[in-house]
């Protein structure tokens, strides 16, 4: 199942996922005087079987102004300044994406594309979150959101994350006015099912790492 | 639950053209691609085009491009199918699909469209 | 632009009979997809990724291929499985012409 909407936004801080579950979806989009390729794939999917999960389909696009000319190698280092890097910026990458039963890895980028990607998520994604360069997280928990169908709808778990300026004088975590869940109300009484997850080591590592910067935007 | 309901059918003239639309209900409208695939009668499904709502991103099959229009309104959570320069080899039935990654999910029921001079 | 091309045309089989239907692409693909149509109604998903059956369908129902070859089987046919079959390409969204299977 898709998950209706995005995750939470949080002020002052990106998220990304570090593998993908089977089902998600990419959309093939193109940077502006580019398109895609005519009959070319609408997106890429994650997909396999219980042993190796992979991107089906591939994204191509081409000049507007030119007609058959085709594009997907990997982009030149100028062209890659104006797309916005989907690596987290440190060597302390929290899970190793192979490894994972039912999950792709990042798609790699394609050559004039779009600098937004738009993922189309599945129930049990799970995403990290980390403030920006020049915010510090002040957590009382998990720097994640997960994806979860409750009683037939779907939602997204609030992250325990706020992001403070580095000058700004700030309360003590103790002090933290307390985030709502997107209902308003605690997650327990909300959810109806508790998923635990094997992240969760990885994610408290993911959450500290304030040098790192995630740049890409998910829609 | 998904639904997918389309307009009524049609009885148009050579050289005129046909607005389908497509309405959607039970899910969220802009986070799927739309698709419009047509069936003459007797003859095979062929795929003319879709649309991400999210964005109006569109694509469309070679053989229908330049005749065909995809567009949608998100407020009314509809998808519409315009093609004009009809003949008599456009009688058919248009469906409109709601694509799910791994496959089209969901079909409208389908709207006969008739070209008869 | 790729063509899947489907066969036979029309199939005409007995209940209980094992039954195959075959597409082939005109290049090399990753996946199939199977659709089924009954008569004055919609198309339903029935097979997706090659091999896997979407939710309700029968597992009299299975799929196999790769690369330009792809093939459903229906293992022991029954009188509800009378309908037409499309195979579907997702990544260039083209449908094969469809197989008709009539009951004897």
């Known amino acids: 199942e898709l998950c209706d909407d995005d995750p939470p936004e949080i002020p002052h801080a990106t998220f990304k996922a570090m593998a993908y579950k089977e089902g998600t979806m990419l959309n093939c989009e193109c940077k502006r005087g580019f398109r895609r390729i005519k009959s070319g794939s609408l997106y890429m999917l994650c997909t396999g079987n219980s042993s190796h999960s992979s991107w089906d389909n591939q994204c191509q696009c081409t000049s507007s102004a030119t007609r058959n000319t085709t594009k997907q190698v990997t982009p030149q280092p100028e062209e890659q300044k104006e797309r916005k890097t989907t690596e987290m910026q440190s060597p302390m990458q929290p899970v190793d994406q192979a490894s994972l039963p039912g999950h792709c890895r990042e798609p790699p980028p394609w050559e004039n594309e779009a600098t937004e990607r738009i993922y189309h998520f599945v129930v049990g994604q799970m995403v990290y979150y980390q403030c920006v360069q020049g915010y510090r997280a002040l957590h009382r928990g998990p720097a994640e959101s997960v994806c979860k169908m409750t009683h037939g709808k779907t939602r997204w778990t609030q992250p325990q994350l706020i992001c403070t300026g580095e000058m700004e004088t700030s309360q003590f975590p103790g002090e933290e006015k307390p985030q709502a869940s997107p209902e308003g109300r605690p997650e327990s009484e909300t959810s109806c099912l508790v998923t635990t997850t094997d992240f969760q080591i990885q994610t408290e590592m993911a959450a500290t790492m304030e040098t790192s910067i995630f740049t890409t935007e998910y829609q | 639950q998904v639904q997918l309901v389309q307009s009524g059918a049609e009885v148009k003239k050579p050289g005129a053209s046909v607005k389908v639309s497509c309405k959607a209900s039970g899910y969220s409208f802009t986070r799927y691609w739309m698709h419009w695939v047509r069936q003459p009668p007797g003859q095979c499904l062929e795929w003319m085009g879709a649309i991400y709502p999210g964005n109006s991103d569109t694509s469309y099959s070679q053989k229908f491009e330049g005749r065909v229009t995809i567009t949608a309104d998100t407020s009314a959570s509809t998808a519409y199918m315009e093609l004009s320069s009809l003949r008599s080899e456009d009688t058919a039935v248009y469906y409109c699909?709601?694509?799910?990654?791994?496959?089209?999910?969901?079909w409208g029921q389908g709207t006969t469209v008739t070209v008869s001079s | 632009q790729i063509v899947s091309t489907q066969s036979p045309d029309t199939q005409s089989v007995t209940p209980k009979e094992k039954v195959t239907i075959t597409c082939r692409a005109s290049s090399s693909r990753s996946y199939m997809q199977w659709y089924q149509q009954k008569p004055d109604q919609s198309p339903k998903r029935w097979i997706y990724d090659t091999s896997k059956s979407a939710s309700g369908v029968p597992s009299r129902f299975s799929g196999s291929g790769s690369g330009t070859d792809y093939t459903l089987t229906i293992n022991s046919l029954e009188a509800e499985d009378a309908a037409t079959y499309y195979c579907?390409?997702?990544?260039?969204?083209?449908f094969g012409c469809g197989t008709k299977l009539e009951i004897k």
């Open positions: 699909s709601r694509d799910y990654g791994y496959y089209f999910d969901f």
């Open positions: 579907h390409q997702r990544s260039s969204y083209t």
